[in-house]
């Protein structure tokens, strides 16, 4: 018989309360861990990294710290006002080598549009990435870096989820070993040549991403070559065997009827905790319905919702959700009509998703207004159309030769939103800022060996 | 097929006036702008006017304001530039073009276009 692989990269997952208070409720919270978890999953299982196969990735744990833990002098993000740098510190700080990765998700829109920072894995001989256990390091402080942090909020918005998606999985990138893309053959955004310009950028290009271009959720072939050697190295030393769901971390997987954590972190009257016996644990309790963490449409006293209760809100491109009385999941919305306007104006509704640009809506594709002399810097903030497939019609949708269109109103793109051909992101004044891939991580790593440069934070 | 077709143009004193007529098929003219841009030998194609066909608004350039006019008449598929008060400046060929989404001056955003008409005005 065959030894079956160690594929699977177990995740610990953290939440601090700024991201409990802008999703709501635990149940919120855990839905986006787990679209977050499957969206790599699905990246990383279908990427060969050079033999290597079918990587995939399990929340062996999960925290999530409330609102209520704001106060707590225990839970170490609590500080409101934090870098990025010492945000991944925090994190660090902790011991965490039960698990392959440790991340911890947030709301906090921090300098220069960085969206996230980890610690790069490599062959060997140095600190950082996937299965690196906690040891001492100079600044006289025990750390993990097998670490990272990903914010869902940049420049004062929020980042569409397939963004944040792509964020996670460019930070686990780092972990895995891969720097950033460079080079012609890795960086095809960056292209003179249309037809490669066109497919976009990959994974780990080092600025902005829109998430809707065909290499935006792709590996190139230079991060595969480095993930690939980290992978041969270092994979033994803490991956493990795919197959059986863990109890425990909150997700409802197969095999388990429900999960509501264990006993410290289960509020659930309807669910045995993972504390319990082998028999018993993540299954209902008698007589039970359903368990609230199985889906919105449970209620806490282990019933299905009624027909007609509300279990989604209304969004730009889709109907609000309705529970149907027999599910505790949230059925899926109905899709407003392609092509309705919404991201305030700057974008249209495609197959119930807000996806394709406002341009799109007049047979135009959306572009960068960018001059080559750098003279019209003020106008790489407004949303650009151009014909298809000809960047010599590229114009601002306040431009004449858009008012067909756009009357003469200039649309802005929203803050937050790629410019500069993904060269930065726009902020609140509507400039663009160039992005600063490479800086965080390097402070971070000069703190480390000397701790002087580091303040401490005050609470 | 897109056909545009110019006409009108000729020879003319300073001073006079001359209407050209830009005659148009193949395409749904309510759905396009049309614009008149001329060219005069060494120099770029510049735009003149243009007008859009669902709403009729128009642009024009500030060198021809207030002395050129364009109009379309849509049951007869055709586009009208009125020139008053010419100037020796105004010696051009002038050509006519149509796009589905564009407006403006900028002839890199019009797709078809006319042969031309020579325009020349004498001092």
């Known amino acids: 018989t065959t030894s079956a692989e160690k594929n699977t990269c177990q995740l610990y997952i953290q939440t601090d309360h700024l991201f409990f208070k802008y999703y709501g409720t635990r149940e919120a919270v855990i839905a986006q861990i787990s679209s977050h978890v499957k969206a790599i999953d699905t990246i990383y299982q279908t990427t060969d990294f050079s033999g290597i196969r079918n990587i995939s990735f399990m929340v062996k744990r999960i925290r999530i710290n409330t609102t209520a833990d704001e106060k707590d002098p225990t839970n170490p993000f609590r500080f409101p006002n934090i870098g990025v740098e010492k945000f991944l510190e925090l994190n660090s700080e902790q011991n965490h080598d039960d698990y392959c990765l440790a991340y911890v998700f947030t709301d906090r829109d921090f300098d220069d549009g960085v969206l996230g920072l980890a610690w790069v894995g490599a062959p060997s001989g140095s600190s950082g990435g996937i299965c690196e256990k906690s040891k001492l390091y100079s600044d006289g402080k025990k750390k993990s870096l097998n670490t990272g942090i990903i914010t869902v909020q940049n420049y004062g918005s929020h980042v569409p989820p397939k963004v944040s998606h792509i964020t996670f999985a460019h930070e686990v990138g780092h972990n895995f070993g891969s720097p950033h893309d460079s080079g012609t053959e890795c960086t095809p955004g960056e292209s003179k040549n249309l037809g490669q310009k066109e497919n976009g950028n990959y994974i780990m290009y080092a600025r902005a991403t829109s998430g809707d271009k065909l290499n935006n959720n792709k590996f190139s072939l230079c991060s595969i070559r480095n993930i690939s050697q980290v992978l041969e190295k270092k994979r033994n030393n803490c991956f493990v065997e795919s197959g059986q769901p863990i109890c425990g971390n909150g997700m409802v997987e197969q095999g388990e009827e429900c999960d509501c954590g264990y006993s410290d972190q289960c509020k659930d009257e309807c669910c045995f905790d993972a504390n319990q016996p082998e028999g018993r644990k993540c299954k209902l309790k008698p007589g039970k319905q359903c368990s609230p963490s199985q889906g919105p449409c449970c209620t806490a006293q282990c019933a299905f919702k009624s027909k007609s209760e509300k279990c989604r809100d209304d969004s730009d491109c889709a109907r609000e959700g309705i529970c149907n009385g027999f599910t505790a999941l949230c059925p899926a919305s109905d899709p407003k009509p392609n092509f309705t306007d919404c991201n305030r104006h700057t974008q249209v509704c495609i197959n119930g998703q807000c996806a394709g640009s406002i341009c799109e809506k007049y047979g135009l594709e959306e572009c960068t207004c960018a001059s080559s002399d750098g003279k019209d810097d003020k106008e790489l903030c407004h949303v650009c159309c151009m014909k298809k497939m000809d960047p010599s019609t590229c114009a601002s949708t306040g431009s004449v030769q858009w008012s067909r269109h756009f009357s003469g109103r200039t649309i802005t793109l929203q803050p937050g939103s790629p410019c500069n051909d993904f060269r930065g992101y726009c902020d609140v004044f509507m400039r663009c800022r160039l992005v600063d891939a490479d800086g965080p991580l390097a402070r971070l790593k000069k703190a480390i060996f000397s701790p002087e440069l580091y303040e401490n934070i005050a609470e | 097929e897109v056909q545009l077709v110019e006409s009108g143009g000729g020879l003319v004193q300073a001073g006079g006036s001359l209407r050209l007529s830009c005659a148009a098929s193949?395409?749904?003219?309510?759905?396009?702008?049309i614009g008149w841009f001329r060219q005069a030998p060494g120099k770029e194609r510049e735009g003149v006017s243009c007008?859009?066909?669902?709403?009729?608004?128009?642009y024009y350039a500030d060198s021809v304001k207030g002395r050129f006019t364009i109009s379309s008449d849509n049951a007869k598929n055709t586009v009208y530039l009125q020139m008053n008060s010419l100037k020796p400046e105004d010696t051009a060929v002038y050509y006519c073009?149509?796009?589905?989404?564009?407006?403006?001056?900028?002839?890199?955003?019009?797709?078809?276009w006319g042969q031309g008409t020579q325009v020349t005005v004498s001092s």
């Open positions: 193949g395409f749904t003219f309510d759905d396009y702008a």
């Open positions: 007008i859009s066909m669902s709403d009729g608004s128009t």
């Open positions: 073009a149509a796009d589905r989404l564009a407006f403006g001056l900028d002839s890199n955003f019009y797709d078809y």
